[in-house]
Interface confidence: low
Amino acid sequence: SERCDDWGLDTMRQIQVFEDEPARIKCPLFEHFLKFNYSTAHSAGLTLIWYWTRQDRDLEEPINFRLPENRISKEKDVLWFRPTLLNDTGNYTCMLRNTTYCSKVAFPLEVVQKDSCFNSPMKLPVHKLYIEYGIQRITCPNVDGYFPSSVKPTITWYMGCYKIQNFNNVIPEGMNLSFLIALISNNGNYTCVVTYPENGRTFHLTRTLTVKVVGSPKNAVPPVIHSPNDHVVYEKEPGEELLIPCTVYFSFLMDSRNEVWWTIDGKKPDDITIDVTINESISHSRTEDETRTQILSIKKVTSEDLKRSYVCHARSAKGEVAKAAKVKQKVPAPRYTVELACGFGAT
């Protein structure tokens, strides 16, 4: 066969769907690889062809679009399952071609089983709510395109296993779930089950997401440097190891990049000749506030090193701060015999 632009297996789009539920899967070519959409391709005389490789098989085979009740069908650039079966798991390929042009991409589709509490191997999206921030809402995700706007589905919300009814701060409102005041106790998995009719049959869509209650922007502050500080002096003799921790607290800020770095005499450690190592550790609070610690270490410090300026810097979307460490050379204790000699000499 003639050459085809093969984008390979697009593992970035690992698609997971629940068993025995409808699934609509768009050909990724038009979403991520080609600069034109399906309508343009279709009007230019290009044809979209689907085929698949079953799990644990190497053989590519056409998709059977003649199953009872049109269980698998194609509509424009969408492959439909009404509903899925467990053995639909495999790698699916969509190929766009005519006599002179060919482009294809494969993607994995995994049909997943869930238990009665909606637990499954499905990777869950995380929705972050600000703690005690006023009313916030989550929306039942990825249900667009399954039924026309004239169809009014029923939507039931669950927290973990439990139907959300009479929760004092969580209220189901159709496709939305409203949190009147988000608390740590609202952390957990929330599931919406959308039920709709189609051609005399009833279908269910199950969507689970994880709610994580995080620090509120109302309480966010610029980075706070706990160490170094004015109370601790790093007093060392030449030849000793110098260890200076820089410990910085960052309020949670959505999409903020938190940075901590050291400068030595105004330069980054990489830009100077002394043998310095820096180790970083990160911890998070329950509301995803972050504490970063960078320990600056010089194995055998010299007199010159003890005269340098060591400054810890921190930056977040809220601002930038810096703090110098107090480093000094330990004054050797006077030797007793010398003191005596001096004493006698003075009399």
Epitope: I131, E132, M159, G160, C161, Y162, N166, F167, N168, N169, V170, L183, I184, S185, N186, N187, G188, S216, S285, R286, T287
Partner: antibody, heavy 116, light 108 residues
Framework: SLEESGGRLVTPGTPLTLSCKVS????????MSWVRQTPGKGLEWIGT?????TTAYASWPKGRFTISKTSTTVDLKITSPTKEDTATYFC??????????????WGQGTLVTVSS | DVVMTQTPASVSEPVGGTVTIKCQAS??????LSWYQQKPGQPPKLLIY???DLESGVPSRFSGSGYGTEFTLTISDLESADAATYYC??????????FGGGTEVVVK
């Protein structure tokens, strides 16, 4: 650990504030409750203060209790004590980041006696 | 408000025996229920949360079961150290906090 204080003999109607000093953890990370136990009787939940300062109360005290906190203490104010408020008052820390709200850590309690 | 009813009020069993304590909620609280043990002069101690999950450090002789309105605490292979009063507590978000009346366990 949790350590309650402030329990004493008071006359009816005299406001009283109990304190719970926390150590080993931060009140910015845990919700806290007050529970009381009347002599020879069972346990009664009074209320909870969440990490952000929001409070929730049982319905039976009808507004006689107020819970507040600082960075290291959780306070329970009994605005107008009656003889029925004679009890040992416990503060307790909720379990943590699951939503089952169990009381996992308790103080030793402080005794309040209301008598004329 | 939810009301928690605990039975029996008192039970006596020999060392090595089994004790079953029941707790009934006046409305469904799903599995939002905890069990506590309290000895004289001491604060309560959490044994079980979420109806059946054992708190860390609690011996596996203690077990909890139930869902909705009916819950059970079972203590098997009874030891003298198990003599105490046991309480259930509703932890459901809309009606948090109510305790059962308590069950005194006497070990003979």
């Amino acid at each position: 650990s949790l350590e309650e204080s402030g329990g004493r003999l008071v006359t009816p109607g005299t406001p009283l504030t109990l304190s719970c000093k926390v150590s080993g953890f931060s009140l910015s990370s845990y919700d806290m409750s007050w529970v009381r136990q009347t002599p020879g009787k069972g346990l009664e939940w009074i209320g909870t203060i969440y990490i952000g300062g929001t409070t929730a109360y049982a319905s039976w005290p009808k507004g006689r209790f107020t819970i507040s906190k600082t960075s290291t203490t959780v306070d329970l104010k009994i605005t107008s004590p009656t003889k029925e408020d004679t009890a040992t008052y416990f503060c307790a820390r909720l379990q943590g980041a699951n939503y089952y709200n169990s009381l996992a850590l308790w103080g030793q309690g402080t005794l309040v006696t209301v008598s004329s | 408000d939810v009301v928690m009813t605990q039975t029996p009020a008192s039970v006596s069993e020999p060392v090595g025996g089994t004790v079953t304590i029941k707790c009934q909620a006046s409305q469904s609280i799903y599995s939002f229920l905890s069990w506590y043990q309290q000895k004289p002069g001491q604060p309560p101690k959490l044994l079980i949360y979420a109806a059946s999950d054992l708190e860390s450090g609690v011996p596996s002789r203690f077990s909890g079961s139930g869902y909705g309105t009916e819950f059970t605490l079972t203590i098997s292979d009874l030891e003298s150290a198990d003599a105490a009063t046991y309480y259930c507590q509703c932890n459901y978000i809309i009606d948090y906090g109510a305790f059962g009346g308590g069950t005194e366990v006497v070990v003979k």
